[in-house]
Amino acid sequence: TPEVWVQVQMEATELSSFTVHCGFLGPGSISLVTVSWGGPDGAGGTKLAVLHPELGTRQWAPARQARWETQSSISLALEDSGASSPFANTTFCCKFASFPEGSWESCGSLPPSSDPGLSAPPTPVPILRAD
């Protein structure tokens, strides 16, 4: 049975920058990939990007760059212009349409331990002074 994976990563240096990686593990060739956020197809998800192997890619804000990584995996860079990132608790979904398998969707979010709101504050770095 085909397997779909989603990886959500937050940039360590830029809390408002996220990257979503998605991949399809199975036979058949990918004919279309749709990335959404806020839920899957039919459950209130909002389209972020559509990637077609021949016709190219189309993306909508806050998506910054959608691209193919391999023939069966894609990445989507997201940039939040606001002060606090809404992405931390958001579900991102990738739907792969493949021939002859059909379409398969997987959703993922930032792991709870990566949520800046849940993690411990950073340890202050001591400032060394030479008197």
Epitope: E3, V4, W5, V6, E105, S106, C107, P111
Partner: nanobody, 127 residues
Framework: QLQLVESGGGLVQSGGSLRLSCAAS????????MGWFRQAPGKEREFVGR??????????SYADFVKGRFTLYGNQARNTVYLQMNSLKPEDTAVYYC??????????????????WGKGTLVTVSS
């Protein structure tokens, strides 16, 4: 001990949608692989799909009959797993069960080796 409680079932017309929820409580740290199964009247329980978390990556796989109509997803922080079901057919009528699965679960094993079961929620699709 892990407790699983399903909700969201009900009566829906053919072509309609439903979202089932599975809330886990108790030993939720063991929620590394979760699955959905279903049992139609007079039939054996069958695998629908499973979701597996590994670090920042979520892996999802489905039974062949799903054919893109269902999406399994979860919220680890809230210990909840969902099954979004679209384009429902009368043959989807069944009791749907949430399950906690061993990490090496093989979908071909059907319901064997499942660690914990919920009590199930009934989905009826009318034509």
């Amino acid at each position: 001990q892990l407790q699983l409680v399903e909700s969201g079932g009900g009566l829906v017309q053919s072509g309609g949608s439903l979202r089932l929820s599975c809330a886990a409580s108790g030993r939720t740290r063991s929620m590394y692989v979760m699955g959905w199964f279903r049992q139609a009247p007079g039939k054996e329980r069958e695998f629908v799909g499973r979701i597996k978390w590994s670090g920042d990556t979520t892996y999802t796989s489905y039974a062949d009959f799903v054919k893109g109509r269902f999406t399994l997803y979860g919220n680890q922080a809230r210990n909840t797993v969902y099954l979004q079901m679209n384009s429902l057919k009368p043959e989807d009528t069944a009791v749907y069960y949430c399950a906690a699965l061993p990490s090496d679960y093989d979908y071909r094993a059907a319901s064997y080796g499942v660690d914990y079961w919920g009590k199930g929620t009934l989905v009826t699709v009318s034509s």
